[in-house]
């Protein structure tokens, strides 16, 4: 029950996070005109990853797309790439996690397969969240650098008396949306990974006969994929054969401390 809740919550948190990453990527307000200590203008500038906009006091808003690829700063391209990678990974992660949800039955899917899918989606969410956080942080760093550069030469002279005021940009709403969304996706991914541990079935203990050779001990489990030999230093710590006749359900219900070596 706790595993299902953790998995479900992880899925929902990741879903919200990825929706936020998509929203942040599409938003125009990655950077907004800094109004503090600036002459008051009747025009407000703000910029996104894909276009820059101007809103006049009248409410008139005009946006222009960045119709060049080569002319854009490499950092902006990097941020775009990080956000897109984050969205793609997140979307794939969501798709995988839907099939991995314990509450959804698809054919005769094994719990081990669901566990693997949960882990895969969890890792994808973690990477997606990290991509978004990295993208937003790179952009924020770029803004801070440009802000102090433009503060240093706030007024650039234009041939004598005429001054041109340099527009300084500060953090826009999209940055905060991106950070929060990236964080949520990351948390959701971690929750999925935690849920995976609870979902993963123990190695199936088949009722098997142990054949003891005279030289060294070998346990043979029919249909299993591990043959434990007596070689190696920690062999004596491994539980080779349980001996007790338990049902398959009991084997899954009572994990032994030796099962996670």
């Amino acid at each position: 029950m706790a595993v299902t809740a953790c998995q479900g919550l992880g899925f929902v948190v990741s879903l919200i996070g990825i929706a936020g990453i998509i929203a942040a990527t599409c938003m125009d307000q990655w950077s907004t005109q800094d109004l503090y200590n600036n002459p008051v203008t009747a025009v407000f500038n703000y910029q996104g990853l894909w276009r820059s906009c101007v809103r006049e006091s009248s409410g008139f808003t005009e946006c222009r797309g960045y119709f060049t690829l080569l002319g854009l700063p490499a950092m902006l391209q990097a941020v775009r790439a990080l956000m897109i990678v984050g969205i793609v990974l997140g979307a794939i992660g969501l798709l995988v996690s839907i099939f991995a949800l314990k509450c959804i039955r698809i054919g005769s899917m094994e719990d081990s397969a669901k566990a693997n899918m949960t882990l895969t989606s969890g890792i994808m969410f973690i990477v997606s969240g990290l991509c978004a956080i990295a993208g937003v942080s790179v952009f924020a760093n770029m803004l801070v650098t440009n802000f102090w550069m433009s503060t240093a030469n706030m007024y650039t002279g234009m041939g004598g008396m005429v001054q041109t005021v340099q527009t300084r940009y500060t953090f826009g709403a999209a940055l905060f949306v991106g950070w929060v969304a990236g964080g949520l996706t990351l948390i959701g991914g971690v929750m999925m990974c935690i849920a995976c541990r609870g979902l993963a079935p123990e190695e199936t203990n088949y009722k098997a006969v142990s054949y003891h050779a005279s030289g060294h001990s070998v346990a043979y489990k029919p249909g299993g994929f591990k043959a434990s030999t007596g070689f190696g230093s920690n062999t004596k710590n491994k539980k080779i054969y349980d001996g007790g006749a338990r049902t398959e359900d009991e084997v899954q219900s009572y994990p032994s401390k030796h099962d996670y070596v």
Partner: antibody, heavy 118, light 113 residues
Framework: QVQLKESGPGLVAPSQSLSITCTVS????????VSWIRQPPGKGLEWLGV???????YYNSALKSRLSISKDNSKSQVFLKMNSLQSDDTAMYYC????????????WGQGTSVTVSS | DIQMTQSPSSLTVTAGEKVTMSCKSS????????????LTWYQQIPGQPPKLLIY???TRESGVPNRFTGSGSGAEFTLTISSVQTEDLAVYYC?????????FGAGTKLELK
């Protein structure tokens, strides 16, 4: 069609206050801004202030302490109030609608003449 | 506040002549965000309220004859009347529409010879 009409007292005694009303038609005050401009006899235009559709107001910095602009959206009226009038406040007072784009004033009222005299 | 300087203060012309008048601002009126210059030109015929001619430094208001052309960028602007008509005799004002408070130039008076 868009129309603006100013109505004022005409004559104001020195140190008294001035109240002018601009009644508009053909557009909504919630959508468009209205500016106030004055023109002393034989002189140039002087921008007094603006009230935007959203309610934001900006004033001429030299007159800021004496000026107040307000509006009543339901009555389609914009009000200019100016305190402590002196003889150099004698002018033709205009209200003008702000264009949507360019921050320009595209429609003007005919103006109301205000004389400050005892 | 932004200072707007217009020159000349008056111009005496003959009908059909090409006229140019200048307007300079103490700060650039160019907005980097949309590359538009927030300068407006008005025409005031004696006894009438001003009339909008040009906004964004070069965009003609609808109904304004195409003999009126606005040009310039940054802090230096020009209004050109390609062929002056008698009805163009008026005072022309430029206005800063970028920085608050919006400020007008002193005007250029167009007179007939």
């Amino acid at each position: 069609q868009v129309q603006l009409k100013e109505s004022g007292p005409g004559l104001v005694a020195p140190s008294q206050s001035l109240s002018i009303t601009c009644t508009v038609s053909g557009f909504s005050l919630t959508d468009y801004g209205v500016s106030w401009i004055r023109q002393p006899p034989g002189k140039g235009l002087e921008w007094l202030g603006v009230m935007w559709g959203g309610g934001n107001t900006y004033y001429n910095s030299a007159l800021k302490s004496r000026l107040s602009i307000s509006k009543d959206n339901s009555k389609s009226q914009v009000f200019l109030k100016m305190n402590s009038l002196q003889s150099d406040d004698t002018a033709m007072y205009y209200c003008a609608k702000q264009r949507y784009g360019g921050n320009a004033m595209d429609y003007w009222g005919q103006g109301t003449s205000v004389t400050v005299s005892s | 506040d932004i200072q707007m300087t217009q020159s000349p203060s008056s111009l005496t012309v003959t009908a059909g002549e090409k006229v140019t008048m200048s307007c300079k601002s103490s700060q650039s009126l160019l907005n980097s965000g949309n590359q538009r210059n927030y300068l407006t030109w008005y025409q005031q015929i004696p006894g009438q309220p001003p009339k909008l001619l040009i906004y964004w430094a070069s965009t003609r208001e609808s109904g304004v004859p195409n003999r009126f052309t606005g040009s310039g960028s940054g802090a230096e602007f020009t209004l050109t009347i390609s062929s002056v008509q008698t009805e163009d005799l008026a005072v022309y004002y430029c206005q800063n529409s970028y920085f608050y408070p919006f400020t007008f130039g002193a005007g250029t008076k167009l007179e007939l010879k």
